[in-house]
């Protein structure tokens, strides 16, 4: 086995090119200089290396950078990123959004892997907060990203970043998360008026207190049932029948189809039957 550690005559790699796909694993180990690999990482993706060969290339980089890869190398990892462990990634210092995008692109179409989760965590912690451009990027790749964060993590989202959030990004958020995001959305959109404001704030109303719902009920907003069903039960319960009727407008008829589901079910039970009857929907308290 000893002779395999020396590079055969004439096989020393001068550059990273397609000829290397014919190298055995031990030849790659012996004949490819790690520093050369690091400077020509951008070429690796264009070459159809096997997984075993990629393991060798990763090993060479690991030896060259035992404390973690520099960003100049990380940005060009491409498919080699899939070979990285969360432990490897924790050694990195990724500060460029371009680097983040390049690596997320490699994992595109797949569930968020532990590697990607670690990468994002490192990136966000390095930046100190989840700024708008980062949030834009992350939600583009992973629409559920925002709702994967804890309320504590969400508290570091600056209100200005809320402009990047699309309704579908909030689909899987629970009430505790929306409790954190709602005041940020109110701050972000506070200079908007009328229906424009309501359209923007609507997705965040799952974090709204009763007082805000009461105020909206007096302003002809015609909230749709999908939004109403996502409201906090404790925020809906104090609303009167008249307030719910005004809040939903023409959508009030949809209450009948939802009468067995929260928060509608719990709200119905709190109302006087005489009041419910004024809706003419046959709701039974």
């Amino acid at each position: 086995e000893v002779e395999k550690t020396a590079c055969p005559s004439g096989k020393k790699a001068r550059e990273i090119d397609e000829s290397l796909i014919f190298y055995k694993k031990w030849e790659l180990e012996a004949c490819v200089d790690a520093a050369l690999l690091a400077t020509q990482m951008d070429r690796v993706n264009a070459i159809p290396f096997t997984y075993e060969q990629l393991d060798v290339l990763k090993h060479k980089l690991d030896e060259l950078y035992p404390q973690g890869y520099p960003e100049s190398v990380i940005q060009h990892l491409g498919y080699l990123f899939l070979k990285m462990s969360p432990e490897d990634i924790r050694k990195w210092n990724v500060t460029s959004l371009e680097t983040l995008k390049a690596l997320l692109e490699v994992n595109k179409g797949h569930e968020m892997s532990p590697q990607v989760a670690t990468l994002i965590d490192r990136f966000v912690k390095g930046r100190g907060q989840l700024d708008k451009d980062t949030l834009d990027t992350l939600t583009a790749f992973y629409p559920g990203y925002l709702c994967s964060l804890s309320p504590e993590e969400l508290s570091s989202v600056p209100p200005s970043s809320i402009w990047a959030v699309r309704p579908q990004d909030l689909d899987t958020c629970d009430p505790r998360q929306l409790d954190v995001l709602y005041p940020k959305a109110r701050l972000a959109f506070q200079n908007m008026n009328g229906s424009e404001y309501f359209v923007k704030i609507q997705s965040f109303l799952g974090g709204a207190p009763t007082e805000d719902l009461k105020a909206l009920s007096q302003q002809n907003v015609s909230m749709d049932l999908a939004t109403f069903m996502k409201l906090r039960t404790d925020a809906v319960l104090p609303l009167t029948v008249a307030e719910v009727q005004k809040l939903l407008g023409p959508h009030v008829e949809g209450l009948k189809a939802e009468e067995r589901h929260r928060p509608v079910r719990d709200w119905i039970l709190r109302q006087r039957q005489d009041d419910l009857d004024t809706l003419g929907l046959g709701l039974q308290g």
Epitope: F189, N191, N193, F198, Q219
Partner: nanobody, 131 residues
Amino acid sequence: QVQLVESGGGSVQAGGSLRLSCAASGNLYNNMCMGWFRQAPGKEREGVASIYIGGGYTNYADSVKGRFTISPISRDNAKSTLYLQMNSLKPEDTAMYYCAAVSIALTREFCAPIVSRYNYWGQGTQVTVSS
């Protein structure tokens, strides 16, 4: 949630002046309204003056126009303060004065000082004007 605490009330002779203050804590946003209301013994609560926090709108009851001035919110760290400057006071201005807020106003006009629209209220401060 918004907490409102009024101060500055007291007794004054007709023709005198008072300045009421309302210290607001909690989340205040530009698209909220704040206002002053009053309630004389045996009478219903009525609107006095109101303002859209984001600016560009104030509204006064006819009975106080030209005498009372509601000032824009002054912000100082976590505390924000609303003022009502009351000049040329009359005995009929005697009442308990309340500071109130509307948590969301989709339009500035919604800030008109109509009691049923306002959903946060302070405890009130007494103003007595003697002749």
